[in-house]
Each structure stands twice: as C-alpha cells, then as structure tokens.
C-alpha cells in the first residue's frame, strides 16, 4: 500500500530536494528558504530566486521551509518550575529545562513539570536521578516506599500495599495491641 500523502507533500515530491512546487504554476520549482528565514514571495520563474526574509525577533524556523510566517518562540513555563536553558534564535526554538537536582515529569507530550530529585532518606539510591526520571530508592528494613519516599512501617495501615513489606512490623504492632486488651 502506498502511504497517503498530503497535498503539500505531493506537490513537494515532484521537485528535487530543497525545492518546492510554485503554488500557482506547477511547472516551476522554487528553492526553499534556509532555516532562520521564511517565504516572502515565491520565485517568479525557473532558475530565479525565491524571496526569503529573516525571521523577526520572537520567531524562528528550524529547517529549510516555504512557510509564509515564522513560528513563534516557545516560552518556558515558570509556573511548572521550568527555566530557560537557551534563548530562541532565528533558527532555533527556546530550550526549556529544570534546575540542578530536579527532573522533568511529562504530563503530556508537550508539557513537563520540574520536581526535586528524591534523596532516598531512610534508604539507598538504586538508580540516580536522570533528566526525565526521578531517583529510584530502595528502602531500609522497617521502611516502605510511598510516593518515592521511604516511610516508617509504623505508618503502614493494613489496607495499604505496604503490608507485605512491613509484615513483621505489623504483626508486632498487632501483638502489642492484643496484649494491651487483656
């Protein structure tokens, strides 16, 4: 099966790489604009230059194109703890990231929030904190993992999943409760 091509891709595939079909005259292939520029006017004829203009401040194009407008620069989301790693230039969008000792959690494909890396108190670091993943902790005996923190088994209620890890402690607590009722 031949994959379905959009109209724009169909038109572009007729011309050699780096060129696109003139929208009003499909016998003309115009040279695409370089990254950092956008299409102001199509080339008037074969072998003639495409009129490309540089992107204005606050906009960019990251690859060769025949876009009528540059793309707006992204803004880092302060409310999500994001910081600017590198500013937007005419040929590259803003790069946003997190501070040192933080990791990115992606709520969706294009939205991330910065959180502090876990320190594994009352446990040991199994896997170090990565750019897109929190530290993986292994808890010491008498502690269980809850929301990536090692919590004392004294906080383990029978209904929770921690019961298997904290079974001896829970039995002890139950024992003391029982002895207290006599």
């Amino acid at each position: 099966l031949v994959p379905h091509l959009g109209d724009r891709e169909k038109r572009d595939s007729v011309c050699p790489q780096g060129k696109y079909i003139h929208p009003q005259n499909n016998s003309i292939c115009c040279t695409k604009c370089h990254k950092g520029t956008y299409l102001y006017n199509d080339c008037p004829g074969p072998g003639q230059d495409t009129d490309c203009r540089e992107c204005e401040s606050g906009s960019f194009t990251a690859s060769e194109n025949h876009l009528r407008h540059c793309l707006s620069c992204s803004k880092c989301r302060k409310e999500m703890g994001q910081v600017e790693i590198s500013s937007c230039t005419v040929d590259r969008d803003t790069v946003c990231g997190c501070r040192k000792n933080q990791y990115r959690h992606y709520w969706s494909e294009n939205l991330f929030q910065c959180f502090n890396c876990s320190l594994c108190l009352n446990g040991t670091v199994h896997l170090s904190c990565q750019e897109k993943q929190n530290t993986v902790c292994t808890c010491h005996a008498g502690f269980f993992l809850r929301e990536n923190e090692c919590v004392s088994c004294s906080n383990c209620k029978k209904s929770l999943e921690c019961t298997k890890l904290c079974l001896p402690q829970i039995e002890n607590v139950k024992g003391t409760e029982d002895s207290g009722t006599t």
């Epitope: 302060k78 409310e79 999500m80 959690h105 929030q113 959180f115 929301e147 990536n148």
Partner: nanobody, 119 residues
Framework: EVQLLESGGGLIQPGGSLRLSCAAS????????MVWVRQAPGKGLEWVSH????????YYADSVKGRFTISRDNSKNTLYLQMNSLRAEDTAVYYC????????????RGQGTLVTVSG
C-alpha cells in the same frame, strides 16, 4: 482542610457547551496554580488545562485547544472551564486540582463531575 467541589457536568449533545465550576476552600486560592484534568471511561488521567495564580498564563492540551477556556475568580475562590463545541471524545469525569508540588501525583483533587457527550 483543602476542599475542591466541581459542578456543572451533565449530558450534552455533540456541538453543545457546558461551563464547569470548582469551588475551593481550606487554602489561599490566589496562591495556587489550578488544574483541570479528566478521566475518560477505562483510561488514565489526562491533563486538560491549567491557569497561573493571577489568571494570566494558561495552558491547553492540543485535544481541547480553541474549544475550552479556563478562567478563575480569586475573589470567589472559584475555577471555571468553559467547554464549547463538545465532542463524544470529551466524555469523562472532570476534576479540578491544585498543581502538584512534591511529585507527579495529585495531593489535592476534587470528587469530579461527569460530562457525557452523546446525541
């Protein structure tokens, strides 16, 4: 004690509109970034939209961009979600929540309001 109470859900035909509200109490509403998330039947939580403390900066998931509008009234401690041009795929339980701080889970989230888009 933090309380979030959503209202405004219901059964609506495709193309229709609804306005969800979330009444907040037990914390300083104006100090918190507020979030709408939703859960479609048999699916996980989806981030729909959020709004900064003063109502200036907003974010929308691609699936709702141009159709939904988030807003807040700090004097009334209330968060809103105006939903227009509703589609069958918008059917879900909608929750309002405080932006998580400690990690990627919702410490404070309402009970939710069901939106059913069917015609």
């Amino acid at each position: 004690e933090v309380q979030l109470l959503e209202s405004g859900g219901g059964l609506i035909q495709p193309g229709g509109s609804l306005r969800l509200s979330c009444a907040a109490s037990g914390f300083t509403f104006g100090n918190e970034v507020m979030v709408w998330v939703r859960q479609a039947p048999g699916k996980g939580l989806e981030w729909v939209s959020h709004i900064d403390r003063v109502g200036q900066d907003t974010y929308y998931a691609d699936s709702v961009k141009g159709r939904f509008t988030i807003s807040r009234d700090n004097s009334k401690n209330t968060l809103y979600l105006q939903m227009n041009s509703l589609r069958a795929e918008d059917t879900a339980v909608y929750y309002c929540a405080l932006l998580p701080k400690r990690g990627p889970w919702f410490d404070y989230r309402g009970q939710g309001t069901l939106v059913t888009v069917s015609g």
